[in-house]
Amino acid sequence: SGVFQLQLQEFINERGVLASGRPCEPGCRTFFRVCLKHFQAVVSPGPCTFGTVSTPVLGTNSFAVRDDSSGGGRNPLQLPFNFTWPGTFSLIIEAWHAPGDDLRPEALPPDALISKIAIQGSLAVGQNWLLDEQTSTLTRLRYSYRVICSDNYYGDNCSRLCKKRNDHFGHYVCQPDGNLSCLPGWTGEYCQQPICLSGCHEQNGYCSKPAECLCRPGWQGRLCNECIPHNGCRHGTCSTPWQCTCDEGWGGLFCDQDLNYCTHHSPCKNGATCSNSGQRSYTCTCRPGYTGVDCELELSECDSNPCRNGGSCKDQEDGYHCLCPPGYYGLHCEHSTLSCADSPCFNGGSCRERNQGANYACECPPNFTGSNCEKKVDRCTSNPCANGGQCLNRGPSRMCRCRPGFTGTYCELHVSDCARNPCAHGGTCHDLENGLMCTCPAGFSGRRCEVRTSIDACASSPCFNRATCYTDLSTDTFVCNCPYGFVGSRCEFPVGLPPSFPW
């Protein structure tokens, strides 16, 4: 589809005569009839196969024709066609005299013709005007013409239909030859396929609009190149979706069991030494002068009971002071002013002279201690039992009652039921107060993970069209990661083709 345009520029009829030679009265009121038809070697009368057009009276005798296209007028003259432009044509231009206002052919006398020109030739579609001038004995006509395509038609013959669009069916404008030119961010034959964010993973990502990167199940990140680990995975990573490979120092199905608390949290203060003592458990060994679970508190100097012989300790700004009982003196009440003659030994203790009677020493019976056997032995005061063990006085001796999981004279040894690796099939072992517990990986159960309870959901190759299959550990089901161009729970349907059902 296109338009043959004819621009009349100047008509000269100096003598103001008709083709018959008769003069027009009072002058030749001139209008034109145009006939456009298929190419004829010799242009002959007959149907104007490509179209006809008439002008109103444009002037008298000789005149220039004004370009009226901008004002919606009739110059250039428009001869539209709705077929492929053949590249050749025949053109007949007749100049007529209009004695009255009725310009219809049947209303004009036959001798009202002023002149007639006929041309033929080839003409390519294009924006450039061809200028021509035809002269007869009495008249001269200057004009130009061209063929252009209608809106939305392109190509050498105006045969290519192309309408720019920006919707679900395409995102493009049209090139001069009618080919589609995709808008930025779109590609494909009809510019329907968005160009995803640069770097978006080909298999794991997709997009529904340009510069987007939407991730397929099991993938995450700006470019969908990071796998999603198993739900609940705390201190682990993955190389394929739904994995949970533990970082160093962590264990368990979800890598949430802290096997190296000391390194991860540095809980011990004031230069104390930290020891890992099980999952999320640690022990701080304090430097002298510090106490508390984390050695976070200083010890009061009196806490070490520095005063001897029954002296009482008082904390002071710059340390401590011992208040000595009668008969004793010195920084720690360590010196006695008594002798055996004073019977200083209590609770049946026997007195022995020292330094020629200037001093003495008490030998205490069992269960009593102190310089004067004045203290009943409480063998638990030093809290010798480790790991929460309970200290029990048993006459002259003591014993530690250990919490479950600990043994040794002072409960200093940790009994690990897990040491012999009792959990089968990669199960994670947990020490409990009264035994152990196995956390089994997916597919296994039983007290020691010895029972296989499920099979690999991907073993039957349920995914089509070269899709990747992943086993979801939490539900024992599979997930198909479809390649581009396929959808469906098993990637069985090509994109754009609805599934055909037998009913």
Epitope: Y282, G292, V293, E296, L297, E298, D303, G388
Partner: antibody, heavy 119, light 108 residues
Framework: QVQLQESGPGLVKPSQTLSLTCTVS??????????WTWIRQHPGRGLEWIGY???????YYNPSLKGRVTISVDTSKNQFSLKINSVTAADTAVFYC???????????WGQGTMVTVSS | ETTLTQSPGTLSLSPGERATLSCRAS???????LAWYQQKPGQAPRLLIS???SRVTGIPDRFSGSGSGTDFTLTISRLEPEDFGMYYC?????????FGQGTKLEIK
């Protein structure tokens, strides 16, 4: 925000064991940072620090009460508890549970519960 | 243990006045590990100052703490009606953690 709530009997007979529980809401008792602490206030008197427990179950007690006091934790219930055995009238007090940060400043307290030791 | 002695036992002042509360330790408090608390009748104590001088988030700037070693001070620059109640100091450098016997701040 984290809140603490003490619970337990308001009256205990002499020589028996006083038992209180502190429930932590709005946060996890499993946090590495905190010392979960018991403090008491005798009627009309000052405050006395009893001791603390950490998430791991490790405890530390005021030496003046050691031997009579046990603090335990139940992480599954987000609770920690206090037991004082062989109580006397001198143990009558308002008991508070509190959260201490890495240094022992008590930024969050329960509203307190009055325990009377009387026959 | 480290004994904390607070003075005065009772302080009677009017709103708008300046209050100065003292806390003296029986032995030096390392790292200025001293805190101040406010307690109203029937309520739990509320932490005001830690580290001798660091005001806790949400505490008005009329409260300030100072001191080191054995002598510490809590100052309330301009008393508001809601500031009256008991004030306790606490040391947390040494075992056992101890509190002062308290200063009662009452309306004159």
């Amino acid at each position: 925000q984290v809140q603490l709530q003490e619970s337990g009997p308001g009256l205990v007979k002499p020589s028996q064991t006083l038992s209180l529980t502190c429930t932590v809401s709005g946060g996890s008792i499993n946090s590495v940072t905190y010392y979960w602490t018991w403090i008491r206030q005798h009627p009309g008197r000052g405050l006395e620090w009893i001791g603390y427990i950490k998430f791991s179950g490790s405890t530390y007690y005021n030496p003046s009460l050691k031997g009579r006091v046990t603090i335990s934790v139940d992480t599954s219930k987000n609770q920690f508890s206090l037991k004082i055995n062989s109580v006397t009238a001198a143990d009558t007090a308002v008991f508070y549970c509190a959260r201490a940060s890495g240094s022992h400043t008590f930024d969050i307290w329960g509203q307190g519960t009055m325990v009377t030791v009387s026959s | 243990e480290t004994t904390l002695t607070q003075s005065p036992g009772t302080l009677s002042l009017s709103p708008g006045e300046r209050a100065t509360l003292s806390c003296r330790a029986s032995q030096s408090v390392s790292n200025s590990y001293l805190a101040w608390y406010q307690q109203k009748p029937g309520q739990a104590p509320r932490l005001l100052i830690s580290g001798a001088s660091s005001r806790v988030t949400g505490i008005p700037d009329r409260f300030s703490g100072s001191g080191s070693g054995t002598d510490f001070t809590l100052t309330i620059s301009r008393l508001e009606p809601e500031d009256f109640g008991m004030y306790y100091c606490q040391q947390y450098s040494r075992s056992p953690i101890t509190f002062g016997q308290g200063t009662k701040l009452e309306i004159k």
